[in-house]
């Protein structure tokens, strides 16, 4: 048995990293796989993840960490019975990818005006709350080339557009991801997506 | 419950040596790193030393790397601390303290011995 | 290594008084923080640890707040008992760091 892909990691900055790697075959990640992982500084014996199933030769394992400061750092060790596969480190401020934005809601009552609003996912005493900026991807179900990114680089979790600057009478959806510069992340995965229809008053033409 | 005991101070010269034991119960003591803790009289409280779990990996702090030694036996659930050369400015009560080994977990420190470094 | 400055050095308070101590870290430590409370001839008794968790045993006046660099311990009533020199600690990092010490005195 032996590790094809070593294992790569990434963490969401809060409670979660997840590793992933592949073996040479098919493996029962859970059964035959073992990764230990510890805090360096910490100096006691590791922890335990059983790896799930992520394909036929793929494991994934979700390492719990009750939080994360810059410094952290941690050793893995990917076991197989008695046998080490694999031994490496991780530090999680150098791999983050933040988690999804929630609770997407279009506003569609301020007259003529989209208001966008959605959850930030960190608690405010975590680092990241202050540091996230989105990116608001809204389509067409009707029309697959109606596809735009809004690039929102303040703090606020919201977005204002004119109901003009889309088609009256079509319904649209709207998602939302996050990143954050300060720690160079990956994007989040995208929030769920949220539908409604657009309908605007069209201004009277002018003689 | 947790329970950690320290042993083996008392009056010691300048120059000489002493070891203080810190005798274990109540939890896993092989799954834990330990430390030592000091406290000058009247002063604020020092860290002194770190031992971890399987006793491969031991840091100290400036003022007493080269003549401390931190060490352990998981076998007897017992931290031992080594100190030679000791100067007036070692005079302390020393505290070992359950290190974590996760940092949500709670600390728990011995009631301290007292070492007395004079002439 | 991790500063931490604590303040007041001393404080004077009468029994019922609500009072604040405040221990600041030179480097974000999350809430990787632990106040404990001192008597004279005694071993620090943990009172607080993870920032804000109160440690079994301990009286509900309690509390600790605060994350990232700055930490308050509060005791909303302060009681006859409550005398004596509070430190804050952070771990982490392997070598622990403590704050200088507040002696509470009580009017």
């Known amino acids: 048995m032996k590790v094809l892909q070593e294992p790569t990691c990434v963490s969401d900055y809060m409670s979660i990293s997840t590793c992933e790697w592949k073996m040479n075959g098919p493996t029962n990640c859970s059964t035959e796989l073992r990764l230990l992982y510890q805090l360096v500084f910490l100096l006691s014996e590791a922890h335990t993840c059983i790896p799930e199933n992520n394909g036929g030769a793929g494991c994934v394992c979700h390492l719990l960490m009750d939080d994360v400061v810059s410094a952290d750092n941690y050793t893995l060790d990917l076991w197989a019975g008695q046998q080490l596969l694999w031994k490496g480190s991780f530090k999680p401020s150098e791999h983050v990818k933040p988690r999804a934005p929630g609770n997407l809601t279009v506003h569609t009552n301020v007259s003529d005006t989209l208001l966008l609003t959605w959850s930030n996912p960190y608690p405010p005493d975590n680092y990241l709350y202050n540091h996230l900026t989105y990116a608001v991807n809204i389509w067409s179900e009707n029309d697959p080339a109606d596809f735009r990114i809004y690039n929102v680089t303040y703090l606020e979790p919201s977005l204002r557009i004119a109901a003009s600057t889309l088609k009256s009478g079509i319904s649209y959806r709207a998602r939302v991801r996050a990143w954050a510069q300060c720690y160079n992340t990956t994007w989040s995965e995208w929030s769920p997506s949220t539908k409604w229809h657009n309908s605007y008053r069209e201004p009277f033409e002018q003689h | 419950q947790v329970q950690l005991v320290e042993s083996g101070g008392g009056v010691v010269q300048p120059g000489r040596s002493l070891r203080l034991s810190c005798a274990a119960s109540g939890f896993t003591f092989s799954s834990y790193a330990m430390h030592w803790v000091r406290q000058a009289p009247g002063k604020g409280l020092e860290w002194v030393a770190v031992i971890s779990y399987d006793g491969s990996n031991k840091y100290y702090a400036d003022s007493v790397k080269g003549r401390f030694t931190i060490s352990r036996d998981n076998s007897k659930n017992t931290l031992y601390l080594q100190m030679n050369s000791l100067r007036a400015e070692d005079t302390a009560v020393y505290y070992c303290?359950?290190?974590?080994?996760?940092?949500?977990?709670?600390?728990?420190w011995g009631q301290g011995t007292l070492v007395t470094v004079s002439s | 290594d991790i500063v931490m400055t604590q303040s007041p050095s001393t404080l004077s308070a009468s029994v019922g008084d609500r009072v604040t101590i405040t221990c600041r870290a030179s480097q974000s430590i999350s809430t990787r923080l632990a106040w404990y409370q001192q008597k004279p001839g005694k071993a620090p008794k943990l009172l607080v640890y993870w920032a804000s968790s109160l440690e079994s045993g301990v009286p509900s006046r309690f509390s600790g707040s605060g994350s990232g660099t700055e930490f308050t311990l509060a005791i909303s009533s302060l009681q006859p008992d409550d005398f004596g020199t509070y430190y804050c600690?952070?771990?982490?990092?392997?070598?622990?760091?403590f704050g200088q010490g507040t002696k509470l005195e009580i009017k």
């Open positions: 303290a359950r290190g974590l080994t996760t940092v949500r977990g709670v600390l728990y």
């Open positions: 600690q952070q771990y982490t990092s392997y070598s622990w760091t």
